[in-house]
Interface confidence: low
């Protein structure tokens, strides 16, 4: 959480970012908000991005002006306009690539003043998991896969019965690298594993941390996924 | 080839007893998980009980649970179903499968009837 | 328990039609979901795993979609050998459940 405040002659809003996470090849945002000003044409909003010359968006007299945006951003954002009179100053990114991450500013200019602050976006790539009986296993065991994950995370396994023990010994993980070349599938297999248990799959890299639980007994199978963006605010 | 051919199947009382088999053959049976699925004549098929490789996982149907017990001889490849307590809802068509990304193979259908 | 409910329940064809059979979870099963064919008189064959796997041998004919809650079966051009009933199944959790069936007859 990031508060800025601006100062325009005695006049300055309370401007407030999120550091956030974008997941590659899908659509992100980059949260921003100030104090509201009913006065939508008297709203300024611009973007800006560190190392960057020219604007990520811009969004003026109630409207986008996108006459000084950068190209790498052309086509792949958005305002949420209906929402900015209320104080709401995020910007949708489209599509989002791991070169998007890095420092951005969001500056504000309303007829109260003036402001800006700071947000660190990283992205990455993250997914859910999901744990299976491996019924094609020689002896019994948990197959945990997780379709997208960059940079390469670590997985460890836990035991609600078996608190504390170190299941490296008995588990096998595996990284593939998807056909685009950036992102991996993780697979994790867990072996000699016992009924009458949960066991928790957890994988995490500096963006994301997922978990899936899978609570085996004589009778049933129940399964629970978990997804905690790291350091967001 | 890969076969599986059920067998046990017959006449029986209600509150008796009876053992379905299964044979396999043309595969590693010790290597794949094991389902009984049944069919009552005309309607649809139910989900009966399941059976991981080396039986460290069983799972039943609430309707059959505490009367039938699945079980495997991975030494004879062959799986069991021991039902007790038959009722008459228990007629039906019984069929084994195997287990692996879906039901892959399945038996011929052995028939079970639970009649006074 | 996961209920699984099929429609149509029966369906009336004629052969070279393209056909599309429904099935809805009550919840969520993600891809874990199987197509079957079942002839009188015999076990089911499987034809589609994991919502959208064609099964070893079955025909292209045959199509899998779906994710979720909601999916689909499609025979793109109907052949006499296919007329049969044809049931979904459920594998993300137990009990394992079938879909009631769809019944295809001939027009």
């Known amino acids: 959480l990031i508060i800025g405040f601006g100062i325009s002659g005695k006049h300055f809003i309370t401007v407030t970012t999120f550091t956030s996470a974008g997941n590659i090849g899908e659509d992100g945002t980059l949260s921003c908000t100030f104090e509201p000003d009913i006065k939508l044409n008297g709203i300024v909003i611009q973007w800006l991005k560190e190392g960057i010359k020219g604007l990520v968006h811009e969004f003026k007299e109630g409207k986008d002006d996108l006459s000084q945006q950068h190209e790498m951003f052309r086509g792949r954002t958005a305002v949420f306009a209906d929402q900015v009179v209320v104080g709401n100053a995020s910007l949708r990114l489209k599509n989002v690539q791991l070169t998007d991450a890095g420092t951005y500013t969001c500056y504000i200019r309303t007829s109260k003043g003036k402001g800006n602050a700071n947000l660190e976006y990283k992205t990455g790539a993250f997914s859910m998991p999901e744990i299976n009986v491996d019924y094609n296993a020689s002896s019994e065991s948990l197959r945990c896969e997780a379709p997208r994950w960059f940079p390469q995370p670590t997985v460890a396994w836990a035991s609600q019965v078996d608190q504390g023990a170190n299941f490296s010994e008995v588990s096998n993980t595996s990284f593939e690298l998807n056909s685009e070349n950036v992102t991996m599938k993780v697979v994790s297999v867990l072996y000699n594993v016992t009924i009458n248990n949960t066991y928790s799959c957890m994988i995490e890299n500096d963006i994301a941390k997922a978990t899936g639980d899978i609570k085996v007994t004589d009778s049933e199978v129940k399964r629970r996924s978990q997804l905690q963006l790291l350091n967001s605010g | 080839e890969v076969q599986l051919l059920e067998s046990g199947g017959g006449l029986v009382q209600p509150g008796g007893s009876l053992r379905l088999s299964c044979a396999a053959s043309g595969f590693t049976f010790s290597s794949y998980g094991m389902h009984w699925v049944r069919q009552a004549p005309g309607k649809g098929l139910e989900w009966v009980a399941s059976i991981s490789s080396s039986s460290g996982y069983i799972y039943y149907a609430d309707s059959v649970k505490g009367r039938f017990t699945i079980s495997r001889d991975n030494s004879k490849n062959t799986l069991y179903l021991q039902m007790n307590s038959l009722r008459a809802e228990d007629t039906a068509v019984y069929y084994c499968a195997r287990a692996s990304s879906g039901m892959d193979v399945w038996g011929q259908g052995t028939t079970v009837t639970v009649s006074s | 328990d996961i209920q699984m409910t099929q429609s149509p329940s029966s369906l009336s064809a004629s052969v070279g039609d393209r056909v599309t059979i429904t099935c809805r979870a009550s919840?969520?099963?993600?891809?874990?979901l199987n197509w079957y064919q079942q002839k009188p008189g015999k076990a089911p064959k499987l034809l589609i795993y994991?919502?959208?796997h064609l099964q070893s041998g079955v025909p292209s004919r045959f199509s899998g979609s779906g994710s979720g809650t909601d999916f689909t079966l499609t025979i793109s051009s109907l052949q006499p050998e296919d007329f049969a009933t044809y049931y979904c199944q459920q594998s993300y959790t137990t009990p394992y459940t079938f879909g009631q069936g769809t019944k295809l007859e001939i027009k």
């Open positions: 919840q969520t099963i993600r891809s874990y």
């Open positions: 994991a919502a959208s």
